[in-house]
Interface confidence: low
């Protein structure tokens, strides 16, 4: 529907509060280094302008596109050149090239200080003093650190953030009330950011078709009672929402997401029996709830897939008439029958089916050629099943920290050129698959594990893309979205790697390690482990274990010592020497 003024349309649809929040998120995701106050000023100027357009849609400039209005506003930032360097060149371009240029300069790993959580009383005072600024600051800090965070979902997080402070700042024990809630929001927020980053990578690197295939598979698992036409409609709408958000069109994205939630709830009888509670909720919670809703029960007595997709004499005719629709139907039918499979496995099966039809429908006897296509699926299904079984056994044997260490060693040997912080972050996250998924029964393990690993490996891919250092990583990340995990799993030790020079400074520790949280201390030790492997990639598990055990004992001993700093200096030298000897460095 054509509106005289797009900005007025979105302002009216979303309301002033959501409009301002979404514009702030959009600006912070584009200009990640700008101070908070500058962004607030820009947002207020845009909001005042929007209000003039609501009052009179024919007013000057009200007919301009949102990209033009927002881009013009961003380009008024005086320090653009000195803060962002070549990003300032975007401002010389016209839309839509200017927006594309801004998108290309989004930084997945911006050079920003770590967010340090102040004392609870300090936070509560700040919250009570100026609630509005406090909440805007939250949006700003998250958005600039996560430039692809799903904006309407960030509004939901902000609402929960506000609620946590509203409740806990009045509690008798503020910290006991607030800190667990903030930890939960932080962990959920990181997970949400990573999941959305994969959606955007899927759209931007592999195209709309790849995203739609993912959506068909996932929605068919979730809504197995919905008919194919219904799933197709939802996929089309969902693709539009995510394309908009990934493209920086946050107002349109939030508006369309609300429309999609409304549609789903109005049509829940033909979609899923699990939506009732979600659809009772207010908008932000409703959308979040729908996105996380459990899979509906599979319809009873679904016929065999073979009838339509192998045995029918019309397979090639149906495929030729509308390839993507036919493959979409195959994916839908397979996915709704297999909530126990990961989405990426379902996509591999669909790709195998497509490849087989491409080959066989051109053969002399097509049916004879594709008759055994389902047999080709068996090894594809068994590979992730076996991998998950082995890794869950290892996790149960080692526990999370040591399981992460095993993965750190494994991945450092595969791709030793990758930076140590990236290897630590990615391997720690890979290791969390154990506690996240291994507790599930067999039928839920694969969708949990392999789809989670896709999200984590995408983090590796986007971080590596910023500063590429390994051809192997580039290859696994770019060749096939659905085969990324098997590609990384198949990598062996990189025999071409020249071990890193030994640097004693890397293994010098100080008394400050004693005051760190358990998590931070683990990260320090895991950083040292990665560096060890980079120095000695041929080191055996036993050698590395011995050195790490000595290291843990050294930290424990010196943290108990009266003169900690002296202990770290003297015992540290001994440890480095002993480690060098043990590893033959």
């Amino acid at each position: 529907d054509a509106h005289k003024s797009e900005v007025a349309h979105r302002f009216k649809d979303l309301g002033e509060e959501n409009f301002k929040a979404l514009v702030l998120i959009a600006f912070a995701q584009y200009l990640q280094q700008c101070p908070f106050e500058d962004h607030v000023k820009l947002v207020n100027e845009v909001t005042e302008f929007a209000k003039t357009c609501v009052a009179d849609e024919s007013a000057e400039n009200c007919d301009k596109s949102l990209h033009t209005l927002f881009g013009d506003k961003l380009c008024t930032v005086a320090t653009l050149r000195e803060t962002y360097g070549e990003m300032a060149d975007c401002c010389a371009k016209q839309e839509p090239e200017r927006n594309e240029c801004f998108l290309q300069h989004k930084d997945d790993n911006p050079n920003l200080p770590r967010l340090v959580r102040p004392e609870v009383d300090v936070m509560c005072t700040a919250f009570h003093d100026n609630e509005e600024t406090f909440l805007k600051k939250y949006l700003y800090e998250i958005a600039r650190r996560h430039p692809y965070f799903y904006a309407p979902e960030l509004l939901f997080f902000a609402k929960r953030y506000k609620a946590a402070f509203t409740e806990c700042c009045q509690a008798a024990d503020k910290a006991a009330c607030l800190l667990p809630k903030l930890d939960e929001l932080r962990d959920e927020g990181k997970a949400s950011s990573a999941k959305q980053r994969l959606k955007c990578a899927s759209l931007q690197k592999f195209g709309e078709r790849a995203f739609k295939a993912w959506a068909v598979a996932r929605l068919s698992q979730r809504f197995p009672k919905a008919e194919f036409a219904e799933v197709s409609k939802l996929v089309t709408d969902l693709t539009k929402v995510h394309t908009e958000c990934c493209h920086g069109d946050l107002l349109e994205c939030a508006d369309d997401r609300a429309d999609l939630a409304k549609y789903i709830c109005e049509n829940q009888d033909s979609i899923s029996s699990k939506l009732k509670e979600c659809c009772e909720k207010p908008l932000l919670e409703k959308s979040h709830c729908i996105a996380e809703v459990e899979n509906d029960e599979m319809p009873a007595d679904l016929p065999s897939l073979a009838a339509d997709f192998v045995e029918s004499k019309d397979v090639c005719k149906n495929y030729a008439e509308a390839k993507d629709v036919f493959l979409g139907m195959f994916l839908y039918e397979y996915a709704r029958r297999h909530p126990d499979y990961s989405v990426v496995l379902l996509l591999r099966l669909a790709k195998t089916y497509e490849t087989t039809l491409e080959k066989c429908c051109a053969a002399a006897d097509p049916h004879e050629c594709y008759a055994k296509v389902f047999d080709e699926f068996k090894p594809l299904v068994e590979e992730p099943q076996n991998l998950i079984k082995q890794n869950c056994e290892l996790f149960e044997q080692l526990g999370e920290y040591k399981f992460q260490n095993a993965l750190l060693v494994r991945y450092t040997k595969k791709v030793p050129q990758v930076s140590t912080p990236t290897l630590v972050e990615v391997s720690r996250n890979l290791g969390k698959v154990g506690s996240k998924c291994c507790k599930h029964p067999e039928a839920k393990r694969m969708p949990c594990a392999e789809d989670y690993l896709s999200v984590v490996l995408n983090q590796l891919c986007v971080l590596h893309e910023k500063t590429p250092v390994s051809d192997r990583v580039t290859k696994c990340c770019t060749e096939s979205l659905v085969n990324r995990r098997p590609c990384f799993s198949a990598l062996e030790v990189d025999e071409t790697y020249v071990p890193k020079e030994f640097n004693a400074e890397t293994f010098t520790f100080h008394a400050d390690i004693c005051t760190l949280s358990e998590k931070e201390r683990q990260i320090k030790k895991q950083t040292a482990l990665v560096e060890l492997v980079k120095h000695k990639p041929k080191a055996t598990k036993e050698q590395l274990k011995a050195v790490m055990d000595d290291f843990a004992a050294f930290v424990e001993k010196c943290c108990k010592a009266d003169d900690k700093e002296t202990c770290f200096a003297e015992e540290g030298k001994k440890l480095v020497a002993a480690s060098q000897a043990a590893l033959g460095l």
Partner: nanobody, 124 residues
Framework: EVQLVESGGGVVQPGDSLRLSCAAS????????MGWFRQAPGKEREFVSA????????YYANSVKGRFTISRDNSKNTVYLQLNSLRPEDTALYYC?????????????????WGQGTLVTVSS
């Protein structure tokens, strides 16, 4: 713009009952969460009860649980609050409120529209 008008308040004795009504106009009533709040003289406004759009969820303050009942009739654009076993401490101005987007049903800042209030006095 939603308008809310409360009625049904009055003066009663401890142990008596009252039924408050709140009629809504100017919006799609069935899309709103409806809540009741009250403010006693010299005190802050406090949450009493709330009901979700299709009456699936109801919420009550601990002080009124088991005595007050909230209900709604979407065909009549009206929400009700049945007050039983009234106590002197229930004396207050009772407000009806409507919210499109609340997730924290008990928080007054989540409600967008408010009525003028109806006075309930419990005294022997």
């Amino acid at each position: 713009e939603v308008q809310l008008v409360e009625s049904g308040g009055g003066v009663v004795q401890p142990g008596d009952s009252l039924r408050l009504s709140c009629a809504a106009s100017g919006g799609t009533f069935s899309t709103y969460v409806m809540g009741w709040f009250r403010q006693a003289p010299g005190k802050e406004r406090e949450f009493v009860s709330a009901i979700s759009q299709n009456s699936i969820h109801t919420y009550y303050a601990n002080s009124v649980k088991g005595r007050f009942t909230i209900s709604r009739d979407n065909s009549k654009n009206t929400v009700y609050l049945q007050l039983n076993s009234l106590r002197p401490e229930d004396t207050a101005l009772y407000y009806c409120a409507a919210s499109r987007f609340t997730s924290w049903y008990t928080a007054d800042y989540e409600y967008d529209y408010w009525g003028q209030g109806t006075l309930v006095t419990v005294s022997s």
